[in-house]
């Protein structure tokens, strides 16, 4: 779970140890603040649960790519 000590900076201290299927995902945000101990990705699920993940892991990168592709509005 992400932890906001001094809002609005949210940090992750532990990463999920299980791969989250893309069907469960709604969005993500990157955590890059120097106030946090490590870079992280926070996935938000379709039932509004927030899950910290390691951006170095391939499944995390693949999931972000997948969300990015499907979120893009096609140009007409």
């Amino acid at each position: 779970q992400p932890d906001a000590i001094n809002a609005p900076v949210t940090c992750c201290y532990n990463f999920t140890n299980r791969k989250i299927s893309v069907q469960r995902l709604a969005s993500y945000r990157r955590i890059t603040s120097s106030k946090c101990p490590k870079e992280a990705v926070i996935f938000k699920t379709i039932v509004a649960k927030e899950i910290c993940a390691d951006p170095k892991q391939k499944w995390v990168q693949d999931s972000m790519d997948h969300l990015d592709k499907q979120t893009q509005t096609p140009k007409t």
């Epitope: 299927s21 893309v22 069907q23 995902l25 709604a26 969005s27 945000r29 699920t45 379709i46 509004a48």
Partner: antibody, heavy 119, light 112 residues
Framework: QVQLLESGAELVRPGSSVKISCKAS????????MHWVKQRPGQGLEWIGW????????EYAPKFQGKATMTADTSSNTAYMQLSGLTSEDSAVYYC???????????????WGQGTTVT | DIVMTQSPLSLPVTLGQPASISCKSS???????????LNWLQQRPGQSPKRLIY???KLDSGVPDRFSGSGSGTDFTLKISRVEAEDVGVYYC?????????FGQGTKLEIK
């Protein structure tokens, strides 16, 4: 072919409990959240809650806390919902469903069971 | 809970004519992640509900492109460009931004 097959109609006594099932085929329930929705005769839809079949996590709408209990068995790819302390207010069709905004390839999906009538 | 108010509740339409259903929420459905979790369902007589539209305007697979969704914040619209006989049923808006998820009371579309 993706399908959610719910158990048959139930006729129950006031004060008793009933457990209805929702068997999935064509996909793995552990990759999804399973939801339950109530529809009283001639009425609208009410969301009951969801279960994460992978770890058993649940979340219930406040109205259904203590009334509904959701479980899942990943080995049989089946979700269950037990309703307790039944009254006439619980007479309804209950639907299981699963949905996503971002599927595995081309956008979202949503699947619904055929509904279980509890009288 | 977020209240979803649909209008009209009954919508008689002539075949081939357009139809429009409004859905208003008691609070903004714009989430902190910048997305708006507003969906539309169709329930034909005697059938289970079926999702038509998600994230305000995205059409589910297999849904005819005569259906479209639009809106933002608290005001949303489902449009059918040319109503066909198979469109008869009840249409619900459904929000997933705020807990608990809630549905509109439904709009019954019938053929005049």
């Amino acid at each position: 072919q993706v399908q959610l097959l719910e158990s048959g109609a139930e006729l129950v006594r006031p004060g008793s409990s009933v457990k209805i099932s929702c068997k999935a085929s064509g996909f793995n329930i552990k990759d999804n959240y399973m939801h339950w929705v109530k529809q009283r005769p001639g009425q609208g839809l009410e969301w009951i809650g969801w279960i994460d079949p992978e770890n058993g996590d649940t979340e219930y709408a406040p109205k259904f806390q203590g009334k509904a209990t959701m479980t899942a068995d990943t080995s049989s790819n089946t979700a269950y919902m037990q309703l307790s302390g039944l009254t006439s207010e619980d007479s309804a069709v209950y639907y299981c469903n699963t949905w996503a905004y971002y599927g595995t390839s081309y956008g979202g999906f949503a699947y619904w069971g055929q509904g279980t009538t509890v009288t | 809970d977020i209240v979803m108010t649909q209008s009209p509740l009954s919508l008689p339409v002539t075949l081939g004519q357009p139809a429009s259903i409004s859905c208003k929420s008691s609070q903004s459905l714009l989430d902190s992640d910048g997305k708006t979790y507003l969906n539309w369902l169709q329930q034909r007589p005697g059938q289970s509900p079926k999702r038509l539209i998600y994230l305000v305007s995205k059409l589910d697979s297999g849904v005819p492109d005569r259906f479209s969704g639009s809106g933002s914040g608290t005001d949303f619209t489902l449009k059918i460009s040319r109503v066909e006989a198979e469109d008869v049923g009840v249409y619900y808006c459904w929000q997933g931004t705020h807990f608990p998820q809630t549905f509109g009371q439904g709009t019954k579309l019938e053929i005049k």
